[in-house]
């Protein structure tokens, strides 16, 4: 159903990393506008993008109001210029998005390796702490405080003289390895959800080596 | 467990009024829509109105618009259905049902008659 | 108003028989269909939404596929407690949603 001239918007997609997140359809509009609406369960549903061209929303605002909920988004179509238009059931033509939990489904975001300090054979590696835009009291929380025990930080470190990678996990954002003395070493990290069943690592770090700019060196 | 149960149906004449509840537990009320679906007898199912979780938005059939008034109270975790002006044809089972974005119905109540008859 | 058919209207079938049972929309409802199943006088219950995605607690055997105006519920092998009456209802004209007449299963 639908009104003349107007397609129902296809391939909706939620893009979502580190809770930042993006509705995008197909297709290109001719001769047509979108408003997008989103809800959780409750049916209470918000209108975002308001009669755009664009073929993609920002629903970040929404959706870190409670990132446990389950979201629907749904694309709307109307004919340019006539936007009171509706089809045959006295709805303006529209289609659903897949679900989407963001707590579940974010892209974890490629995690940065903020310091490393040696102190003899030992080697605190630390993972800066992310910025998430979910809200609390004000302030932007950290991806340690939206999942808190839930991430996990996996290490891949090895001695830049040969390629035999060791690995280590933490719950924090702080390693702390033991390493032999005299040698360098490199580092990348990932941040993994071991509860999920989608999404579960991110990509690795860029890579950071011992006798660069970030590591702090103690010969005890 | 999610438990909806039904109340307030019985016997009345044309033109009269009854008021369905519909008390709900073992889930969050206020995150979910509600809707009513009846059933006439030995017919199938027929969506009557449905309520967003906030109350803020309803929907009717067109059969009952203007007739019948659906509401919620978040505090108490109930679903009202208010049934004015009421006609032989509404002679149906009533079931409260739990629906996500208020598209499907994922839970039902065991359904409450309401029978219409001079 | 969008219309769902269901056929076919009863259907007699044995234990362990496979049983697939069709609903197809006046118009195309993308994925936007849910199945349920209803014994005499007790509630319907829902099996089935957005087509092919099983509700929580509902044994494998039950299964939905479909899209655009066809759809199909199958029963991979029939146990004594299917017997029942099954609906398809539509959600993709929301708020008018439309359910199927029905499709009573019985025992040969």
């Known amino acids: 159903s639908g009104t003349t001239n107007t397609v129902a918007a296809y391939n909706l997609t939620w893009k979502s990393t580190n809770f930042k997140t993006i509705l995008e359809w197909e297709p290109k509009p001719v001769n047509q506008v979108y408003t997008v609406q989103i809800s959780t369960k409750s049916g209470d549903w918000k209108s975002k993008c308001f009669y755009t061209t664009d073929t993609e929303c920002d629903l970040t605002d929404e959706i870190v109001k409670d990132v446990k909920q389950t979201y629907l988004a749904r694309v709307f179509s109307y004919p340019a210029g006539n936007v009171e238009s509706t089809g045959s059931a006295g709805e303006p033509l529209y289609e659903n998005s897949p679900e989407f939990t963001p707590y579940l489904e974010t892209n974890l975001g490629q995690p940065t390796i903020q310091s490393f300090e040696q102190v003899g054979t030992k080697v605190n590696v630390t993972v800066e702490d992310e910025r998430t835009l979910v809200r609390r009291n004000n302030t932007f929380l950290s991806l340690r405080d939206v999942f808190g025990k839930d991430l996990i930080y996996t290490l891949y470190y090895w001695k830049s003289s040969s390629s035999g990678k060791k690995t280590a996990k933490t719950n924090t954002n702080e390693f702390l390895i033991d390493v032999d003395k005299g040698e360098n070493y490199c580092f990348s990290v990932q941040a993994v959800i071991p509860s999920r069943t989608v999404n579960r690592k991110s990509t690795d770090s860029p890579v950071e080596c011992m006798g660069q700019e970030k590591g702090e060196f103690r010969e005890i | 467990e999610v438990q909806l149960l039904e109340s307030g149906g019985g016997l009345v004449q044309p033109g009269g009024s009854l008021r369905l509840s519909c008390a709900a537990s073992?889930?969050?009320?206020?995150?979910?829509?509600m809707s009513w679906v009846r059933q006439a007898p030995a017919k199938g199912l027929d969506w009557v109105s449905g309520?967003?979780?906030?109350?803020?938005?309803?929907y009717y059939a067109d059969s009952v618009k203007g007739r019948f008034t659906i509401s919620r109270d978040n505090s108490k975790d109930t679903l009202y259905l208010q049934m004015n002006s009421l006609r032989a044809e509404d002679t149906a089972v009533y079931f409260c049902?739990?629906?996500?974005?208020?598209?499907?119905?994922?839970?039902w109540g065991q359904g409450i008659l309401v029978a219409v008859s001079s | 108003d969008i219309q769902m058919t269901q056929s076919p209207s009863s259907l007699s079938a044995s234990v362990g028989d496979r049983v697939t049972i069709t609903c197809r929309a006046s118009?195309?409802?993308?994925?936007?269909l849910a199945w349920y199943q209803q014994k005499p006088e007790k509630a319907p219950k829902s099996l089935i939404y957005?087509?092919?995605s099983l509700q929580s607690g509902v044994p494998s055997r039950f299964s939905g596929s479909g899209s655009g105006t066809d759809f199909t519920l199958t029963i991979s092998s029939l146990q004594p407690e299917d017997f029942a009456t099954y609906y398809c209802?539509?959600?993709?004209?929301?708020?008018?949603?439309?359910f199927g007449q029905g499709t009573k299963l019985e025992i040969k």
């Open positions: 049902a739990k629906t996500p974005w208020g598209y499907y119905f994922d839970y």
């Open positions: 073992g889930f969050t009320f206020s995150n979910y829509a």
């Open positions: 309520i967003s979780g906030s109350g803020v938005t309803t």
């Open positions: 118009q195309g409802i993308s994925s936007w």
């Open positions: 957005a087509a092919s």
């Open positions: 209802q539509q959600y993709n004209s929301y708020p008018l949603y439309t």
